[in-house]
């Protein structure tokens, strides 16, 4: 799996999970989230060469098509696979609210 | 939806469905598929600017992050959303086989 256990230990040009810490205030301009101040969002990036973690029949076909026809612009792309939620604390007026935001943290990637 | 109805009628630099006909023999080097000779596989390509068809909370956050930090390399990518199967005819020896191949045709795209 193209997850932290694999990607953060290997220097990888191909599609892999990349570390990305997002500071809500500095990076997004969001002041409304009280806690946490930021989080490890991560992201997916890298090349998708022939059969590198292709996730569907179409991406495998496209991968082969792109290999045999290197001048073609139709190639798979490195995107998130597994995502996890993030729990945040914010205020409405003086009332604290705890919310779980779904699909905020990328845990693994794929070529699709 | 970033499907044929929208994308094939509009000149679109942003993430959209692109037409791609694949001839099995010419483009993939596959002789084993008897029918059809090829099919409209399509593919997804184009830029993913702020909120352009973002499909998850993470891709929306990444989209905003990328807008506020344009020097960053962390941006969403244009990939397939809905896929459909393709029915093929091939032979094992002299025995004809009909098979439905899942996820062979891209019908719509998203920024992920």
């Amino acid at each position: 799996a193209l997850d932290a256990a694999y990607c953060f230990r290997n220097v990888q040009d191909n599609c892999c999970l990349r570390p990305l810490y997002i500071d809500f205030k500095r990076d997004l301009g969001w002041k409304w989230i009280h806690e946490p101040k930021g989080y490890n969002a991560n992201f997916c990036a890298g090349a998708c060469p022939y059969l590198w973690s292709s996730d569907t029949q179409h991406s495998r076909v496209l991968s082969l098509y792109n290999t045999i026809n290197p001048e073609a612009s139709a190639s798979p792309c490195c995107v998130s696979q597994d995502l996890e939620p993030l729990t945040i604390l914010y205020y409405i007026g003086k009332t604290p609210k705890i919310e779980q935001l779904s699909n905020m943290i990328v845990k693994s990637c794929k070529c699709s | 939806a970033l499907d044929a109805a929208y994308c094939f009628r509009n000149v679109q630099d942003n993430c959209c469905l692109r037409p791609l006909y694949i001839d099995f023999k010419r483009d993939l080097g596959w002789k084993w598929i008897h029918e059809p000779k090829g099919y409209n596989a399509n593919f997804c390509a184009g830029a993913c600017p702020y909120l352009w068809s973002s499909d998850t909370q993470h891709s929306r956050v990444l989209s905003l992050y990328n807008t506020i930090n344009p020097e960053a390399s962390a941006s969403p990518c244009c990939v397939s959303q809905d896929l459909e199967p393709l029915t093929i005819l091939y032979y094992i020896g002299k025995t004809p086989k009909i098979e439905q191949l899942s996820n062979m045709i891209v019908k719509s795209c998203k920024c992920s």
Epitope: Q57, R60 | G29, W30, Y90, E99
Partner: nanobody, 118 residues
Framework: EVQVVESGGAAVQPGESLRLSCAAS????????MGWFRQAPGKQREMVAI???????NYADSVKGRFTISRDATKNTVYLQMNSLNPGDTAVYYC????????????WGQGTQVTVSS
């Protein structure tokens, strides 16, 4: 059970040749796109060459003109003829089979070691 088995790896000197073989189960061979990949220590696995059932081939830039991939349907075997070997070719070489019938799968062999050193 589908099997992909490589053989032919060895230790050779720079400039020498070697031929790797890969035998695949007959049930998949006729429809499979066969490939050779390699992985050197501390590096990512990379494609070396592929060959389709129709004989279309593609090679990594680093091996073009030196390596030749071929397949023999009568023996369900794919070969990689490697000429003018150099130390940069040292790696574990893996054979794989991409199939989409009877199901979509990528089958990998266990690998065979090729060492090029003087």
């Amino acid at each position: 059970e589908v099997q992909v088995v490589e053989s032919g790896g060895a230790a050779v000197q720079p400039g020498e040749s070697l031929r790797l073989s890969c035998a695949a189960s007959g049930s998949i061979f006729n429809t499979a796109t066969m490939g050779w990949f390699r992985q050197a220590p501390g590096k990512q696995r990379e494609m070396v060459a592929i060959i389709t059932d129709g004989g279309r081939t593609n090679y990594a830039d680093s091996v073009k003109g030196r390596f030749t991939i071929s397949r023999d349907a009568t023996k369900n075997t794919v070969y990689l003829q490697m000429n003018s070997l150099n130390p940069g070719d040292t790696a574990v070489y893996y054979c794989n089979a991409l199939t989409i019938v009877p199901r979509s799968s990528i089958y990998w062999g266990q690998g065979t070691q090729v060492t090029v050193s003087s």
